[in-house]
Amino acid sequence: TPEVWVQVRMEATELSSFTIRCGFLGSGSISLVTVSWGGPNGAGGTTLAVLHPERGIRQWAPARQARWETQSSISLILEGSGASSPCANTTFCCKFASFPEGSWEACGSLPPSSDPGLSA
């Protein structure tokens, strides 16, 4: 069964800047990847980026740079300033759509150990 993994990391240089990495573990070819925060898209989440392998990448603030890492994984850097910047417990979700198999999604947030507020 295909699976999606999500990894969230806070940049050490900019404490309110995040990197989200997502990947698809399956045999299908990816048609679209949607990255959202605050929950899944359609369930209260807000779209940060949409990546299409042929038609390009669309991104919305505070997303700074979305890109394909491989044919089945992507990364997204979030700007760390302003009212719309994420906090340590923000949930990020990635949805991979593969035709004609369907869609798979997963969500993740910053591991508690990487919260700078908890470090000594």
Epitope: S31, L32, P40, G42, E54, A97, S98, F99, P100, S103
Partner: antibody, heavy 120, light 107 residues
Framework: DVQLVESGGGLVKLGGSLKLSCVAS????????MSWIRQTPEKRLELVAA????????YYLDTVKGRFTISRDIAKNTLHLQMSSLKSEDTALYYC?????????????WGQGTSVTVSS | SIVMTQTPKFLLVSAGDRVTITCKAS??????VAWYQQKPGQSPKLLMY???NRFTGVPDRFTGSGYGTDFTFTINTVQAEDLAVYFC?????????FGGGTKLEIK
């Protein structure tokens, strides 16, 4: 303007064969996933066969597997459905449709349909 | 495969009425639900995608909502031209499956 025009339907004997065609215009045919959907006499809609834009990944309804083959001719902007060993339950109106990645694979354009009647 | 149970099968309404059609999925389909309109003698036409997004040219009296397993399609202020059969469809997992349809008739 996006247009899909089906042809090839008709009256065929039980166990016979038929090849449906769908000529596409108004868009880059090779960039879109395509499918054949049928509407039964009871007006139920069923996705019969689908093909990825890469022309590799395909889907078939369980009841047509091994009997139907979906293919496309990029040079002629044409989608095909080769149907063999036809059964009475294959009697339906057959539509070809385009899937839009950005719309969650919804079928944004449909042809006018071509009728297939399997008689004993 | 995912079963889409659509209710009601028939609706008889007057012009100006508000109409609600529901679709229930046998398992979660996220927000990958589309709604189609099929007028007599015509092929289905896309109305809504991703549950609540209207396709090009679709009037704003058509709205959709829901997530997961329960979805609602509403026509606010029904007009005579809305006489049609309406279908929901999930595209979350292969095979894509349709609801049984709702036939809307105008008094």
């Amino acid at each position: 303007d996006v247009q899909l025009v089906e042809s090839g339907g008709g009256l065929v004997k039980l166990g016979g064969s038929l090849k449906l065609s769908c000529v596409a215009s108004g868009f880059t045919f090779s960039s879109y996933h395509m499918s054949w959907i049928r509407q039964t006499p009871e007006k139920r809609l069923e996705l019969v066969a689908a093909i990825n834009s890469n022309d590799i990944n395909t889907y078939y309804l369980d009841t047509v597997k091994g009997r139907f083959t979906i293919s496309r001719d990029i040079a002629k902007n044409t989608l095909h459905l080769q149907m063999s060993s036809l059964k009475s339950e294959d009697t339906a109106l057959y539509y070809c449709a385009r899937h839009e990645d950005y719309y969650g694979f919804a079928m944004d354009y449909w042809g006018q349909g071509t009728s297939v009647t399997v008689s004993s | 495969s995912i079963v889409m149970t659509q209710t009601p099968k028939f609706l008889l309404v007057s012009a100006g009425d508000r109409v609600t059609i529901t679709c229930k999925a046998s398992q979660s389909v996220s927000n990958d639900v589309a709604w189609y309109q099929q007028k007599p003698g015509q092929s289905p036409k896309l109305l809504m995608y991703y549950v609540s997004n209207r396709f090009t040219g679709v009037p704003d009296r058509f709205t959709g909502s829901g997530y997961g397993t329960d979805f609602t399609f509403t026509i606010n202020t029904v007009q005579a031209e809305d006489l049609a059969v309406y279908f929901c469809q999930q595209a979350y997992r292969s095979p894509w499956t349709f609801g049984g349809g709702t036939k809307l008739e105008i008094k």
